[in-house]
């Protein structure tokens, strides 16, 4: 059936980069400027994506593939195919509707994106705070108070690093 259909349908012979032009007896015509077809047998070409404003062109549009965008410095991509750009903030801040705002006391963000997260609660692991947290950095947990008794080693091996966002509340 597929073979029969392709014999009857001249459009199936039109390669990527062309379209089957109904106005010209279904001749394969090249995609016009600023358009593309990524598969064969198409009856229209798709309009190329334009990377405007915050969007920068990462890959130019060709007759067979769409343009690809990324974000200008100070912004980062969100969504499939970089469908959105979101503003960066400084470390120690998070993005809100009101722009970049400092992390509240007891929270931190060590990246230019994402939200402020609570400092690790060292006492949940039976440890004490070795280095205080800041807006930009999590606390560093040290040995438990019991480990600091005379004769005990004053340094414990570091615990395995936790995944971001998974520190205990």
């Amino acid at each position: 059936f597929e073979r029969t259909r392709s014999l009857q349908d001249p459009c199936s012979n039109c390669p990527a980069g062309t379209f089957c032009d109904n106005n010209r007896n279904q001749i394969c015509s090249p995609c016009p400027p600023n358009s593309f077809s990524s598969a064969g047998g198409q009856r229209t070409c798709d309009i190329c994506r334009q990377c405007k404003g915050v969007f920068r062109t990462r890959k130019e549009c060709s007759s067979t593939s769409n343009a690809e965008c990324d974000c200008t410095p100070g912004f980062h991509c969100l969504g499939a195919g970089c469908s959105m750009c979101e503003q960066d903030c400084k470390q120690g801040q998070e993005l809100t509707k009101k722009g970049c705002k400092d992390c509240c006391f007891g929270t931190f963000n060590d990246q230019k994106r994402g939200i402020c997260r609570p400092w690790t609660n060292c006492s949940l692991d039976g440890k004490s705070v070795l280095v205080n947290g800041t807006k930009e950095r999590d606390v560093v947990c040290g040995p438990s108070p019991a480990d600091l008794s005379p004769g005990a080693s004053s340094v414990t091996p570091p615990a395995p690093a936790r995944e971001p966002g998974h520190s205990p509340q």
Epitope: S83, T96, K97
Partner: nanobody, 123 residues
Framework: EVQLVESGGGLVQPGGSLRLSCGAS????????MFWFRQAPGKELEWVAN????????YYVDSVEGRFTISRDNAKNSLYLQMNSLRAEDTAIYYC????????????????WGQGTTVTVSS
């Protein structure tokens, strides 16, 4: 086609005023947060102001608070930026942008931008 077109830029003296407009087409304007951004020569893009769908929430970068006013007319599919007491440091290309679907619930991204309009503040 989804489109944003800015207008109203120009040359103005320090202390003067300008009103920028942004016409929207190809989407339901009243469903989206809208933004103004700007890019001064040699500097990164900067968020200026944003407004929610019905105009009841408005936010500004500190440097323009009290001088600039963002507003919208959903019946006219238009966004505005009234700029008063203009300073040399306000010289920039001003862009209108649309908040992406789900803005403020799951992200703070923008997905559609205009080509920009140039504002020059100089004596």
């Amino acid at each position: 086609e989804v489109q944003l077109v800015e207008s109203g830029g120009g040359l103005v003296q320090p202390g003067g005023s300008l009103r920028l407009s942004c016409g929207a087409s190809g989407f339901t304007f009243s469903n989206y947060w809208m933004f103004w951004f700007r890019q001064a020569p040699g500097k990164e893009l900067e968020w200026v102001a944003n407004v929610n769908q019905n105009g009841s929430e408005k936010y500004y970068v500190d440097s323009v608070e009290g001088r600039f006013t963002i507003s919208r007319d959903n019946a006219k599919n238009s966004l505005y930026l009234q700029m008063n007491s203009l300073r040399a440091e306000d010289t920039a290309i001003y862009y209108c942008a649309r908040g992406g679907e789900g803005y403020s619930d799951s992200h703070y991204g923008t997905d559609v931008w205009g080509q920009g309009t140039t504002v020059t503040v100089s004596s």
